[in-house]
Interface confidence: medium
């Protein structure tokens, strides 16, 4: 989780003005409770927005807006902090609005944004607006929260952002995965156009069932370049069990740009269907 | 290199059901499927079944209903339990590693072939079924 | 089930023999069969796979040949330690089944 540096972050609007400041996720506010505090954020709002950096770079960063309540409570309101949580991993980000002039009703609704918290692709975020300063102990919460998922690299925005291209959102493998016969599966992918090694994981699963009953891992040295965009071949051979019939391949390159950590492709091979009752095999094979 | 020992009661009582363990050392149960094979006297060598680390198990259809295999890949072991025994399954039962790999490399198409078989055996444990 | 016959059941032979087991399968097993040797009281012990690859650390007077539903297990030279008990294994499908096992003692 970061911040867009772009820019100086400005949070002022006419008839109001407000610093953006970093914050430790601790308002004072907790430390020293008021006795008269604003209410809650209304209609908090989280999109999915791109912005440019100004190396020329696309990220997607979580847009954020929201309103005030109309009452009285304004003239108590001294800013805001907005908090992202990433999920998976509990890391936490917050800055802080500080209004430097008191607010005053007028004929709109107060209605503020943020969009400088760059997000991750396929990753949840958990997105919090507390007015400040937060209630006493025992109070009525003032804040509101929402999560937000981004999506992932195949989403057609997001494959073209700095963070996707560089995991290898543009390669396209277009896996094609046949069974040959009993024991083998004959996967075909497309190379991309760098002198990179890829590796094949595959997963087998019984009818119906999560556990796997097979699982190896093969390794494709890396192509010529002559061999860029064309179509690689793998058959692989399989111990033979009755019901280990459903095969995940997954392909994992590994492109310089994001090494361990490339987007990886799959394609899944479902166990063939099975007739309700079982047909007599012939003793021969007919002509017609 | 990996060895396997089985443990467990050399007596078991008829209608009584008779687990073995197998203890796997010098290497990890992870990746291979684990068998359990087992020799009546003064006959051939009968597969009881198998199973993955993942708990993926096969039987031999003529044991299945009497056979539970599992693994513990905390203490890399994996178990027998055969129920309901009779005299006929007193016998010498082992336990074996199933699995290697070999990778025939072509040019531009590539060749993975998985040879099985049980390539590493434990040295056996008698079970006697009488009363 | 895939049914593994041996032949023959037993065999006499002398040191310096050349010995040649048959193993058939009811069914073709491609090459999916392995060899084993068995020594009273002991454990079977692989000695090709693959129907003819030679297990590491077996000496090169044993080679197996075959696939589908007909392999045979040579010993070119036999040697006073090779006097035991041998099976072949399919592992082509479940359930796994061995030969009834071909004994070779001394003539």
């Known amino acids: 989780l970061r911040l867009l540096d772009h820019r100086a972050l400005v949070c002022s609007q006419p008839g109001l003005n407000c610093t953006v400041k970093n914050s430790t996720c601790l308002d004072d506010s907790w430390i020293h409770p008021r006795n008269l505090t604003p209410s809650s954020p209304k209609d908090l709002q989280i999109q999915l927005h791109f912005a440019h950096t100004q190396q020329g770079d696309l990220f997607p960063v979580a847009h954020i807006e929201w309103t005030l309540q109309t009452d009285a409570s304004i003239l108590y309101l001294e800013g805001a902090e907005l908090s992202v949580l990433q999920l998976n991993t509990n890391e936490r980000l917050c800055v802080r609005f500080e209004f430097l002039s008191k607010l005053r009703h007028h004929h709109r609704r107060w209605r503020f944004t943020f969009s400088h918290f760059v997000v991750d692709p396929d990753q949840e975020y958990e997105v919090t607006v507390h007015h400040l300063p937060k209630p006493i102990p025992d109070g009525d919460p003032n804040h509101q929260s929402k999560n937000f998922l981004v999506p992932d690299c195949e989403h057609a925005r997001m494959k073209v952002t700095t963070p996707c291209m560089s995991s290898g959102s543009l390669w396209d493998p277009n896996i094609t995965v046949e069974t040959l016969e009993a024991h083998q599966l004959r996967v075909s992918f497309t190379l991309w156009n760098e002198s990179t090694h890829y590796q094949i994981l595959l997963t087998s699963f019984p009818h119906m069932e999560n556990h796997s009953c097979f699982e190896h891992m093969h390794h494709i040295p890396a192509p010529r370049p002559e061999e860029f965009h064309q179509r690689s071949n793998v058959t692989l051979t399989l111990r033979n069990l009755k019901g280990c019939c459903r095969h995940q391949v997954q392909i994992q390159p590994f492109f310089s740009s994001c090494l361990n950590d490339c987007l990886r492709h799959s394609a899944t091979v479902s166990c063939p269907e099975m007739p309700d009752t079982p047909e007599p095999i012939p003793d021969y094979m007919p002509l017609w | 290199q990996v060895q396997l020992q089985e443990s467990g009661p050399g007596l078991v009582k008829p209608s009584e059901t008779l687990s073995l363990t197998c203890t796997v050392s010098?290497?990890?149960?992870?990746?291979?499927?684990w068998n359990w094979i087992r020799q009546s006297p003064g006959k051939g060598l009968e597969w009881i079944g198998d199973?993955?680390?993942?708990?993926?198990?096969n039987y031999n259809p003529s044991l299945k209903s009497r056979v539970t295999i599992s693994v513990d890949t905390s203490k890399n072991q994996f178990s027998l339990k055969l129920s309901s025994v009779t005299t006929a399954d007193t016998a010498v039962y082992y336990c074996?590693?199933?699995?290697?790999?070999?990778?025939?490399?072509?040019?531009?198409?590539?060749?993975?072939?998985?040879?099985?078989?049980?390539?590493?055996w434990g040295q056996g444990t008698t079970v006697t079924v009488s009363s | 089930d895939i049914l593994m016959t041996q032949s023959p059941s037993s065999l006499s032979a002398s040191v310096g023999d050349r010995v040649t087991i048959t193993c058939r399968a009811s069914?073709?097993?491609?090459?999916?069969l392995g060899w084993y040797q068995q020594k009273p009281g002991k454990a079977p012990k692989r000695l090709i796979y693959?129907?003819?690859s030679l297990q590491s650390g077996v000496p090169s007077r044993f080679s197996g040949s075959g696939s589908g539903t007909e392999f045979t297990l040579t010993i070119s030279s036999l040697q006073p330690e090779d006097f035991a008990t041998y099976y072949c294994?399919?592992?082509?499908?479940?359930?796994?089944?061995f030969g009834p096992g071909t004994k070779v003692d001394i003539k």
């Open positions: 074996a590693r199933d699995g290697e790999l070999a990778n025939y490399y072509g040019s531009g198409s590539y060749q993975f072939y998985y040879y099985y078989g049980m390539d590493v």
């Open positions: 199973i993955y680390y993942s708990g993926s198990t």
């Open positions: 069914q073709g097993i491609r090459n999916d």
């Open positions: 010098g290497g990890s149960i992870s990746n291979y499927y």
């Open positions: 693959a129907a003819s």
């Open positions: 294994l399919q592992h082509n499908s479940n359930p796994f089944t």
